[in-house]
């Protein structure tokens, strides 16, 4: 167990000549906040997944108002570090996704409004224990510095917190056969025998006589890859004579899911299902409010006015997960083809088809585009004899010449609030409805019924998330 | 002007070693990490490695390993690679380039290392 | 080590054409992706950084696209002076590697 700590240094503009505007101004102030996700470094997992190896939320910045005529400053930050604990032993690579938002705290109309500034990427090589490490990162006109470490919670020890330290019980030496644990020179390291066969590659031990295993091994000594080989076993693949597993210790094993959650397994791990009021990878988070804007993805938040309450999200079609976090994901049975990329929409699966390629499924095989430009990163898709621009998120118009607004449509439903995002737009609904477009009733023809108006909420307030 | 100047070419012969500097200026230099890249006879490029001059840490590709060595001289703003057991697979064109973690906006000239007997 | 796919090895082009070229990760790169530019002779030239930022000094018609494993980069117009090889390289993870180049000539 222990905690990936990170530092945010500053966040303005990078470097060059072009500095960008402030995201602030006097009329509509802000503040900063950052969202670090964490997952296994060599994992095959789609950007939308959840944080395997944990999430965090800074707290809000101090309020800046622009100087009018002045170029962005680096803008003033939360104070504090970025904390994600980690349960089990800390891969030694990872990747990670760090967010900066925005919080408007202008006249909005039921609180404030949040948009995504940038957003930077990498996959990082890291032991437990070790120095701060630096990272420079440029997302757009922005620049963001900020260093991370991983380190150990006590008795854990070592690059990736396995082994366990214990107090001297002599006071000169350590028993036989036992070194010091630096830097914890008072103290010993544990005499912690694993079950006999272990691997000492893919498996470790934080008690006596068990063998946990390292992401992508299983089995019960961790010698067996974990692969997608078909398997009679609920565990999956194994021994040399079938191939197959006979069941070991599962992931659900000792309940990692911590405050109540419920542990189910996944193909490749665990998932916790969280009690009202905590959520997380092990539902280990607490204390959140609606007014924390805990439902992603247009889920409408109920209850949680206060931290003693708890609250639940309703999560519109194509969501799923506590927090509705999670995309329920048919893109899996690959409907899109000639190399299309599948966009699972919640409401509707869409393919971006290649270029070359155009209908529902892309399965329509057109003519190049030959000699036509698109302006600002549009594709250019061809079909019935004429050429159009497929135009990169803020650009319109035919050759997408044009700043677009994703807003302008007024795409959100039933008197939801448009808001500029990083992925296009996000609507804020208005009570009783929920979607990414606000284009379902709470409580369609008497399903269900929630209440009009959650608790702590006023009717006529949008509902507000990340 | 942020700029980036690198030592003057090298002939070396096999199994020496050399070091090659790159001094800059224009920017404060503890603020950007440096990395150096190899281009093998006008061919595609190589990522040897960087370097973080306010922390001294270095992260190396794999494959350079146990071959450069980089350090820099915080006093003087300048970072210097060294590459040791010299052999013709050496012979390239070498570039320091400040940047972050993912890019490198300003290059040096290059410095060309020919190792002949 | 992450391989980068680099396409067309070389082309030639007449003045005012549209140019593309592309380029395919081994795996997912989340847009750390950067293009370069170098001339016979001359230092690589950063164009691109983050898939589609364009690096302040650098003519408007250069764009860059794409996510996932496929990025491209393309010059609406070419010009003379656009003749050069051009690099893409990953940033994503450690070591940063490039593909193998794209040299581009007048036609």
């Known amino acids: 167990a222990g905690v990936f700590e990170l530092q945010i240094h500053s966040f303005g503009p990078g470097p060059g000549p072009g500095a960008p505007r402030s995201p602030c101004s006097a009329r509509l102030p802000c503040r900063l906040f950052f969202r670090v996700c964490l997952k296994p470094g060599l994992s095959e997992e789609a950007a939308e997944s959840p944080c395997a190896l944990g999430a965090a939320l800074s707290a809000r910045g101090p309020v800046y108002t622009e100087q009018p005529g002045a170029p962005a400053p680096d803008l003033p930050l939360p104070d504090g570090l970025l904390q994600v604990p980690f349960r089990d032993a800390w891969p030694g690579t990872f990747s990670f996704i760090i967010e900066t938002w925005r919080e408007e705290l202008g006249d909005q109309i039921g609180g404030p409004a949040w948009s995504l500034l940038a957003r930077v990427a990498g996959r990082r090589r890291l032991a437990a224990g070790g120095p701060w490490a630096r990272d420079i990162q440029r997302a757009g006109a922005w620049e963001l510095r900020f260093s991370y470490r991983a380190r150990c919670e006590p008795p854990a020890v070592g690059t990736a917190c396995t082994r366990l330290c214990r107090p001297r019980s002599a006071p000169s030496r350590c028993g036989p056969g036992l070194r010091p644990c630096a830097p914890l020179e008072d103290e010993c390291e544990a005499p912690l025998v694993c079950r006999a066969g272990c691997s000492p590659e893919h498996g470790f031990c934080e008690q006596p006589g068990e063998c946990r295993c390292l992401e992508g091994w299983t089995g019960p000594l961790c010698t067996v890859p974990v692969s997608t080989s078909s398997c009679l076993s609920p565990r999956g693949p194994s021994s040399a004579t079938t191939g197959c597993l006979v069941p070991g210790p599962g992931p659900c094993d000792g309940n990692p899911c911590a405050n109540g959650g419920s542990c189910s397994e996944t193909p490749r791990s665990f998932e916790c299902t969280c009690p009202r009021g905590f959520y997380g990878l092990r539902c280990e988070v607490s204390g959140v409010t609606c007014a924390d804007g805990p439902c992603f993805n247009g889920g409408l938040c109920v209850g949680g006015a206060d931290p003693d309450s708890a609250y639940i999200c309703h999560c519109p079609p194509g969501f799923q997960g506590s927090n509705c976090e999670k995309r329920v994901d048919r893109c899996s049975l690959q409907p899109c083809r000639n190399g299309g990329l599948c966009l699972d929409l919640g409401h509707a699966l869409r393919c971006r088809c290649r270029a070359g390629f155009a209908g529902p499924r892309c399965e329509h095989d057109l003519d190049d585009c030959a000699g036509r430009a698109c302006a600002n990163g549009g594709t250019c898709v061809e079909g019935g004899g004429a050429h159009r621009c497929s135009c990169a998120l803020g650009f319109g118009g035919r050759d997408c010449r044009e700043r677009a607004d994703p807003c302008a449509a007024r795409p959100c439903a039933h008197g939801g609030r448009c808001y500029a995002h990083f992925s296009g737009l996000v609507c804020a609904c208005a009570p009783g409805y929920m979607g990414a477009r606000c284009e379902f009733p709470v409580h369609p023809d008497g399903a269900s019924a929630l209440p009009a108006a959650p608790p702590g909420l006023r009717p006529g307030d949008p509902q507000r998330y990340l | 002007e942020v700029q980036l100047q690198q030592s003057g070419p090298e002939l070396e012969k096999p199994g020496a070693s050399v070091r090659i500097s790159c001094k800059a200026s224009g920017y404060s230099f503890t603020d950007y990490n440096m990395h150096w890249v190899k281009q093998s006879n006008g061919k595609s490029l190589e990522w040897i490695g960087n370097?973080?001059?306010?922390?001294?840490?270095?992260n190396y590709n794999q494959k350079f390993e146990g071959k450069a060595t980089l350090t820099v001289d915080k006093s003087s703003s300048t970072a210097y690679m060294q590459l040791k057991s010299l052999t013709s697979e050496d012979s390239a064109v070498y570039y320091c380039?400040?940047?972050?973690?993912?890019?490198?906006?300003?290059w040096g000239q290059g410095t060309t290392l020919t190792v002949s007997s | 080590d992450i391989q980068m796919t680099q396409s067309p090895a070389s082309l030639a082009a007449s003045v005012g054409e549209t140019v593309t070229i592309t380029c395919r990760a081994s795996e997912n790169i989340y847009y750390s992706l950067a293009w370069y530019q170098q001339k016979q002779g001359k230092s690589p030239q950063l164009l691109i950084f983050n898939a589609n930022s364009l690096e302040d000094g650098v003519p408007s018609r250069f764009s860059g696209s794409g996510s996932g494993t496929q990025y491209s980069m393309k010059i609406n117009s070419m010009q003379p002076e656009d003749t050069a090889t051009y690099f893409c390289?990953?940033?994503?993870?450690?070591?940063?590697?490039f593909g193998g180049g794209t040299k581009l000539e007048i036609k």
């Open positions: 390289k990953q940033a994503y993870d450690v070591p940063w590697t």
């Open positions: 370097i973080d001059p306010y922390y001294g840490g270095t």
């Open positions: 380039a400040r940047g972050g973690n993912n890019y490198g906006d300003y």
